[in-house]
């Protein structure tokens, strides 16, 4: 079948990185500069993508593959092949389908990427909250009440009403 196909269509013999040049008796010609063909048998080469402005080159164009872009620092890619750049979220936010959203109460994100994670539950380790959590920071767990200096109350006071910045016990 391949032999029959190549007899019928000489262009099928042209490998990636070349095109079947109708102007030169269907000879396989190399793709011109700044163009590529990623598959064999193509009658034209595609123009290489140029990574400009907020887009920067992640991978240079070659005769057989297109250039690949990513975004300049402070931005990240959106879409197939990085067609758009979106500003990184701030600490205390996470990226959702609708963009950057503040972390919900009881969660935090200390990075500009990734998702909001639940505050550490200090009581699971028998510890108490030393520093309250925020949208940007996890709670800091302190020693358990029993570890406190002699004479200190070993009774944990009742948890206050839930307010922003307080870890649920």
């Amino acid at each position: 079948f391949e032999r029959t196909r190549s007899l019928q269509d000489p262009c099928s013999n042209c490998p990636a990185g070349t095109f079947c040049d109708n102007n030169r008796n269907q000879i396989c010609s190399p793709c011109p500069p700044n163009s590529f063909s990623s598959a064999g048998g193509q009658r034209t080469c595609d123009i290489c993508r140029q990574c400009k402005g907020v887009f920067r080159t992640r991978k240079e164009c070659s005769s057989t593959s297109n250039a690949e872009c990513d975004c300049t620092p402070g931005f990240h890619c959106l879409g197939a092949g990085c067609s758009m750049c979106e500003q990184d979220c701030k600490q205390g936010q996470e990226l959702t389908k609708k963009g950057c959203k503040d972390c919900c109460f009881g969660t935090f994100n200390d990075q500009k990427r990734g998702i909001c994670r639940p505050w550490t539950n200090c009581s699971l380790d028998g510890k108490s909250v030393l520093v309250n959590g925020t949208k940007e920071r996890d709670v800091v767990c302190g020693p358990s009440p029993a570890d406190l200096s002699p004479g200190a109350s070993s009774v944990t006071p009742p948890a206050p009403a839930r307010e922003p910045g307080h870890s649920p016990q």
Partner: antibody, heavy 116, light 107 residues
Amino acid sequence: QVQLVQSGAEVKKPGASVKVSCKASGYTFAGFEMHWVRQAPGQGLEWMGAIDPKTGGTDYNQKFKDRVTMTRDTSISTAYMELSRLRSDDTAVYYCARDLGYFDVWGQGTLVTVSS
Amino acid sequence: DIQMTQSPSSLSASVGDRVTITCRASQDIRSNLNWYQQKPGGAVKLLIYYTSRLHSGVPSRFSGSGSGTDYTLTISSLQPEDFATYFCQQSEKLPRTFGGGTKVEIR
């Protein structure tokens, strides 16, 4: 904050040229392509082209290719769009816009009136 | 060039109404679709990018959806400040092209 401030309204005669400026502030000018879009009275938005301030490289809409020139002066964070051989149907508001694959910030627009 | 067909070209609605505007591309634009609002004074603002992502500061009553060639902008409960003209725009290929616009007027 990020801002694009354009030059003032212009009145030109047919056959003349107009040069509209767009001054950027609040961000690194060279880091983002600047696009130009126009809107004729009562009409929709029409993309004219773009310039990469870092290199000066341009992409033009074929419709304007032989009449438009986009330039920039990085020292004053300003992009320019010059349209030559003006006709009455070039009467429009011309906008510059910063590009991230979408136009997140637009200039206030510059009205260019072409009239004899 | 990729043609963008927006409908309706105009609509009348009341405050509190749910409004839907559609945009159809002449070929698959792989979600590279943005929506803009233009107030009568001429100022243009980005509302939604990459089909559904809300630009910072845009109220959550605005939402976008779609894929392939068909896209939608929805205003869940129209407010007085939403009376304006809305444009879709594709970023899949140069030249960037816009829909013809939808003017949202007070009924």
